[in-house]
């Protein structure tokens, strides 16, 4: 039975040219996290595997950095980065948990981070 829940940074905004941290956190389960996949709509951005470490898709290597933790840092943001991002937690024995984050990249300097939890 899947008892876990994924907490995410929710809907967030950031300035064009800036960077943002995408964070998810799996709680309320003792399941072992074996892998976390990060996707942007229909594109695989990165994978963090418990044994193999990080794999960043080559087409995103210059703008995506692993971490902190199981999170993902997006750099040199453009308005085209606006959209949905998904963290997919592969766990044993529970199975798969998915979290959703919506990022809006703004032209102006009025971008604010709306977050459900603090990013250190």
């Amino acid at each position: 039975m899947m008892t876990g829940t994924i907490e995410t940074t929710g809907n967030i905004s950031a300035e064009k040219g800036g960077s943002i941290i995408l964070q998810c956190h799996l709680s309320s389960t003792t399941a072992q996290v074996t892998q976390v996949n990060w996707e942007q709509q229909d594109q695989l951005l990165a994978i963090c595997n418990a044994d193999l470490g990080w794999h960043i898709s080559p087409s995103f290597k210059d703008r995506v950095a692993p971490g902190p933790g199981l999170g993902l840092t997006l750099q040199s943001l453009t308005v085209n980065d606006t959209g949905e991002y998904f963290c997919i937690y592969h766990t044993y024995p529970d199975g798969t948990y998915t979290g959703r984050i919506f990022l809006e990249v703004l032209e102006s300097s009025v971008a604010e981070h709306g977050a459900r939890f603090q990013i250190p």
Epitope: T34, Q35, E39, D42, Q43, L44, I47, N49, D51, L52, H55, S57, S59, H90, Y92, P93
Partner: antibody, heavy 118, light 107 residues
Framework: EVQLLESGGGLVQPGGSLRLSCAAS????????MHWVRQAPGKGLEWVAS????????YYADSVKGRFTISRDNSKNTLYLQMNSLRAEDTAVYYC???????????WGQGTLVTVSS | DIQMTQSPSSLSASVGDRVTITCRAS??????LNWYQQKPGKAPKLLIY???SLQSGVPSRFSGSGSGTDFTLTISSLQPEDFATYYC?????????FGGGTKVEIK
């Protein structure tokens, strides 16, 4: 250098059993999911089964479920496929393949031929 | 199960030609799509993974594109060693499934 070497193929009668092995070298075997893929003569590729790093999860194609068992021995760097109740339609070259991140199959063995015939 | 439909099933081309092979999934598979090359009597070889990432050691004339349900493998300038059969494969969910293959023959 990554190497995968299958063995155990051969001629077997319908209803018989066979155990395939895949000896791995050149990488940390226990860190990777492993797969069996087969190819009937003159046909395309068909995924058969896969096993996660620590044997925690095993997956099978419907066509072999209940007849084939995938297993691994990380201390011996070896992948196995126990095939029971074999049928003529199981005749194929069987390949083992490494599956990093459970997303692609980057290294394949040379294959071992299984022929099921009376 | 996710069905993978490849087209064409075969094609004839000349050295230097630009060749395009398409693969369609029966449901969205994000970018969990890989391409393999197989020559007679040999094991398949990974060319492209995650729809568009070139596997290490594979010539840059091979490229992949697409996401969701429609994907393309392109060989920009066909070389003599490229005459082979090409397969797409989805890894979005088990069972993993392959396309039926595209045989690239010499015209």
């Amino acid at each position: 250098e990554v190497q995968l070497l299958e063995s155990g193929g051969g001629l077997v009668q319908p209803g018989g059993s066979l155990r395939l092995s895949c000896a791995a070298s050149g990488f940390t075997f226990s860190s990777y999911s492993m797969h069996w893929v087969r190819q009937a003569p003159g046909k395309g590729l068909e995924w058969v089964a896969s096993i996660k790093y620590s044997s925690s999860n095993k997956y099978y194609a419907d066509s072999v479920k209940g007849r084939f068992t995938i297993s691994r021995d990380n201390s011996k760097n070896t992948l196995y496929l126990q095939m029971n109740s074999l049928r003529a339609e199981d005749t194929a070259v069987y390949y083992c393949a490494r599956g990093p991140y459970d997303v692609w199959l980057d290294y394949w063995g040379q294959g071992t031929l299984v022929t099921v015939s009376s | 199960d996710i069905q993978m439909t490849q087209s064409p099933s075969s094609l004839s081309a000349s050295v230097g030609d630009r060749v395009t092979i398409t693969c369609r999934a029966s449901q969205s598979i994000s970018s969990y799509l890989n391409w393999y090359q197989q020559k007679p009597g040999k094991a398949p070889k990974l060319l492209i993974y995650a729809a568009s990432s070139l596997q290490s050691g594979v010539p840059s004339r091979f490229s992949g594109s697409g996401s969701g349900t429609d994907f393309t493998l392109t060989i920009s300038s066909l070389q003599p060693e490229d005459f082979a059969t090409y397969y797409c494969q989805q890894s979005y969910s088990t069972p993993l499934t392959f396309g039926g293959g595209t045989k690239v023959e010499i015209k």
